[in-house]
């Protein structure tokens, strides 16, 4: 073969273009846009196209793009045509994986590992710098040492204890010492050195329809910060729920849908069906979010090609607060919520 | 402006190995291929490979194939191309270019690599 | 591979002349085609993509046409700065191929 790509795991086919009938160009000049802009659906960024000419409703994850129809920048995505190679006319709207990290003024990709100093293994997930210590000195001596000392050898980075009463030090109980530190290895001094640490999970980043949340952790064999990701679907898009609002009420806190359906990625279909709940929306300023959730996995099953399962956003429960903004304002998500006094229906 | 800025001119002896850079700013390096290209003296263009950077997938042409190497560096929006057991017949300057639909736009200055004992 | 064969492989012509090139490629690369423009010690330059999208910023004398196999890349009107080399390049399929160029003289 005159190409060997390295396999990638999930390729967008795209739609073909009308091949010889029309040109497959995306923006045309002089611009030519409609009188008025369009109403986005909630959530979707009204911004100017990739032609730089008109006012259009920004591309959401997942959905198809062209250098016209561009990602919604607010959300951090933007078109990954690596499906359309070598023609890149046509891609997919995709997560920007993280942002980095400036440490000591030295920027930092988001997923790089690196060390500030000698004594310390650091990795940038997301804006945010996480280190673990390469300095997992053993415990201090044993009983038989009453005065230990942590002090700096000449040369060496990290600190050593010493026993300022060496000359009474037992042979036996050195010869036990040095092969019960040997025997304890690195792993576990590194694992008696981790405090567990979890962030929440960051707010959904679309507010209808599939987004991403994520959040860091260190609970993991290594210790390490480590990114996590769920999908996440707030509510849906395409279903009105201002009209299952019971007569006299303001507010929808839940929505379910009647009807048990299977969940859809990039094409690929859930190996079962689930009847999800999902928040629901008020008529006036308050906006609904999870507060009872958990996470799920589900399995995907693809027409071509193998499976695979991803982390789900499972919603149990949801309240209507009163710290909201425009719905198309993404960072109304960052609002930090009111005490639950103000949840109301 | 998106622009593309390439490493210095380089000279090799047959069978060493060289590696050019190709520096990324004014766009997101991460969101599009970079591809290579060269030209040798008085001759025309000939496509070498393309890599991803944000995933780190490579293709290269069959020519190529086993002694050329592309990767990337995001931190520095860096991208690199590794050509070994060079012979007298690589000497040509090198481009990279960013994959844009249906072409490539735009693309770096180029990097003269002379192989000569 | 598919083979891109550009003919003539050199013109003279004046200014103010106007000049077609033509591309064929072996075999049906519906409208995957590129122009560039490349001038001595330079890096090449895109003018057209898709057979017949004009690149921003580049003059409209220049324009392209075709599908399938055959495609022309025009000047109306020829500039003393269009004097350079022409290449064709087909996106169409990997591995991506280039015609061996047009060199566009002054007469």
């Known amino acids: 073969t005159a190409l060997s790509p390295t396999p990638t795991t999930m390729t967008f086919t795209p739609a073909p273009l009308e091949e010889t009938t029309t040109r497959p160009e995306f923006c045309k000049w002089p611009c030519e846009c409609p009188q008025s802009p369009p109403r986005c659906p909630l959530g979707v960024s009204l911004i100017t196209d990739g032609c730089e000419c008109c006012k259009i409703c920004a591309q959401q994850l997942g959905d198809n793009c062209t250098e016209a129809a561009i990602c919604d920048p607010h959300r951090g995505l933007y078109c990954d045509y690596s499906g359309d190679r070598p023609r890149y006319a046509i891609g997919v709207c995709a997560q920007v994986v993280g942002v980095g990290c400036v440490l000591d003024g030295v920027r930092y990709t988001n997923g790089e590992s690196f060390q500030p100093n000698c004594r310390y293994n650091c990795t940038c997930i997301d804006g945010t710098v996480g280190c673990t210590p390469l300095c997992l000195s053993p415990r201090p001596p044993r009983l038989w040492c009453r005065q230990p000392r942590h002090v700096r050898v000449p040369g060496q980075c990290c600190e050593q204890w010493v026993c300022d009463d060496d000359a009474r030090r037992p042979r036996q109980t050195a010869l036990l010492d040095t092969r019960a530190f040997a025997a304890s290895g690195a792993v576990e001094q590194r694992y008696e050195n981790c405090i567990a640490y979890t962030s929440p999970w960051s707010p959904c980043s679309t507010t209808c329809g599939l987004g991403i949340s994520t959040r860091i952790s260190n609970v993991n064999a290594r210790c390490w910060p480590e990114q996590e990701s769920r999908l996440c679907n707030l509510r849906p898009c395409d279903v009105d729920i201002q009209l299952h609002i019971k007569a006299g009420k303001k507010c929808l806190a839940v929505y379910q849908p009647e009807e048990a359906t299977n969940f859809t990625l990039a094409g690929c279909v859930s190996t079962r069906t689930y009847r999800p709940k999902y928040c629901g929306v008020c008529t006036d300023n308050r906006c609904c979010i999870p507060y009872k959730s958990k996470t799920i996995s589900v399995d995907f099953q693809c027409p071509e090609g193998p499976g695979f399962s991803r982390q789900v956003l499972w919603i149990n429960a949801c309240f209507c607060n009163l710290s909201c903004r425009n719905p198309n304002d993404i960072f109304a998500d960052l609002e930090s919520y009111p005490d639950f006094e103000e949840i109301a229906n | 402006e998106v622009q593309l800025v390439q490493s210095g001119a380089d000279v090799k002896k047959p069978g060493a190995s060289v590696k050019v850079s190709c520096q990324a700013s004014g766009y997101t390096l991460t969101s599009y291929d970079i591809h290579w290209m060269r030209q040798a003296p008085g001759q025309g263009l000939e496509w070498m490979g393309w890599?991803?950077?944000?995933?780190?997938?490579?293709g290269y042409a069959e020519k190529f194939q086993g002694r050329v190497a592309m990767t990337s560096h995001t931190s520095t929006s860096t991208v690199y191309m590794e050509l070994s057991r060079l012979t007298s017949e690589d000497t040509a300057v090198y481009y990279c270019?960013?994959?844009?639909?249906?072409?490539?736009?735009?693309w770096g200055q180029g990097t003269l690599v002379t192989v000569s004992s | 591979d598919i083979q891109m064969t550009q003919s003539p492989s050199s013109v003279s012509a004046s200014v103010g002349d106007r000049v077609t090139i033509t591309c064929r490629a072996s075999q049906d690369i519906s409208r995957w085609l590129a122009w560039y423009q490349q001038k001595p010690g330079k890096a090449p330059k895109l003018l057209i993509y898709?057979?017949?999208t004009l690149q921003s910023g580049v003059p409209s004398r220049f324009s392209g046409s075709g599908s399938g196999t055959d495609f022309t890349l025009t000047i109306s009107s020829l500039q003393p700065e269009d004097f350079a080399t022409y290449y064709c390049q087909q996106a169409n399929t990997f591995p991506i191929t280039f015609g061996q160029g047009t060199r566009l003289e002054i007469k």
């Open positions: 890599i991803n950077p944000n995933s780190g997938n490579t």
């Open positions: 898709a057979a017949s």
């Open positions: 270019a960013r994959g844009a639909m249906g072409g490539f736009d735009p």
